[in-house]
């Protein structure tokens, strides 16, 4: 019955079983509802808007990493509908802390104004 179906399942009245909601492809996100036993008849997948990406499945589109604005890094690969942006080396005037574990966002560049003496990215 409906209540037994999981987060991404709908109740198929023909088979009397819970069935997996159709997953979206890379670069798309679900539109309208499917899950916990019900499925909208017009349920489908829409493309990710500009500056967002999705790997597909039931994932909503997420914003690309802001390499320059947030990480103060160069853009190695710009993101598209299917892939996140990849950040490269720090922007001029910024450096990366050595031996610092990556945080949840990856590596963050810091201003040379805060750099220890002789930091290679900040010399000259």
């Amino acid at each position: 019955e409906y209540s037994n179906c999981g987060e991404n399942e709908y109740y198929n009245q023909t088979t009397g079983l819970c069935q997996e909601c159709p997953p979206c492809g890379p670069g798309e996100e679900p539109y309208l509802s499917c899950g916990y036993g019900t499925k909208d008849e017009d349920y489908g997948c829409v493309p990710c808007p500009a500056e967002k990406f999705s790997k597909g499945g039931y994932q909503i589109c997420r914003r690309h990493k802001d390499c320059e604005g947030f990480f103060r890094a160069t853009v190695l690969t710009p993101g598209d509908m299917e892939n996140d942006a990849e950040c490269g080396p720090c922007l001029p005037g910024y450096y990366m802390l050595e031996n610092r574990p990556r945080n949840i966002y990856g590596m963050v560049c810091y201003s040379c104004l805060l750099a220890p003496p002789n930091t290679k990215e900040c010399v000259g």
Epitope: G27, E41, V46, P47
Partner: antibody, heavy 119, light 107 residues
């Protein structure tokens, strides 16, 4: 085999009625939402109406609301458009078009049937 | 309703040319933009869906791009069989709307 074939077009007097049909073949009709789209002579395409696979969702363009009725018979793999109170501006080629599963565009179109509203 | 504008109603190009047809939406349609080809005999065919994805069986010379409100269809190596009218269509919200069409002819 043509997947979508419209019929029922012809000459109708203003204020008259007409019922168009669209016969589907070569695919599981009951899995697909279906649309009617029209094109007036020397004009662009205009979306007219949509019906979901199981008929639970039906939508119309404002220009036809209250005068046209979209319906379907999944057992006979046929889509219909009942047109009433016809006006000269309804003169057009009427196409039925299939909505791709899970997507929001028309992936297969019929060849169209012409409706002419004139006295 | 979302208005779709194809600023060029007709254009003429030579065989082998690269042709770009543009389409503008009255508001952001989040890449939910599709392109159709209507041949002179009236037959309509889907070419590109969701801005840049090619429908199966469509020649690789057809490509799409854009984002937000501005989109384009490019034919990279014009062939005789490409003589047709091209329509953009937004599938973001009902009522679905189409551009006025761009009629492509060979010089």
């Amino acid at each position: 085999e043509v997947p979508l074939e419209e019929s029922g077009g012809g000459l109708v007097k203003p204020g008259g009625s007409r019922k168009l049909s669209c016969a589907a073949s070569g695919f599981t009709f009951s899995d697909y939402g279906m649309h009617w789209v029209r094109q007036a002579p020397e004009k662009g395409l205009e979306w007219v109406a949509y019906i979901s696979s199981g008929s639970s969702a039906i939508y119309y363009a404002d220009t036809v609301k209250g005068r046209f009725t979209i319906s379907r018979d999944n057992a006979k793999s046929t889509l219909f458009l009942q047109m009433t109170s016809l006006r000269s501006e309804d003169t057009a080629m009427y196409y039925c078009a299939r909505r791709e599963i899970l997507r929001y565009y028309f992936d297969v179109w019929g060849a169209g049937t012409t409706v002419t509203v004139s006295s | 309703d979302i208005q779709m504008t194809q600023s060029t109603s007709s254009l003429s190009a030579s065989l082998g040319d690269r042709v770009t047809i543009s389409c503008r939406a009255s508001q952001d349609i989040s890449n939910n933009l599709n392109w159709y080809q209507q041949r002179p005999d009236g037959t309509v065919k889907l070419l590109i869906y969701y801005t840049s994805r090619s429908q199966s069986g469509v020649p690789s010379r057809f490509s799409g791009s854009g984002s937000g409100t501005d989109y384009s269809l490019t034919i990279s190596n014009l062939e005789q069989e490409d003589v047709a009218t091209y329509f953009c269509h937004q599938g973001k919200t009902l009522p679905y709307t189409f551009g006025g069409g761009t009629k492509l002819e060979i010089k």
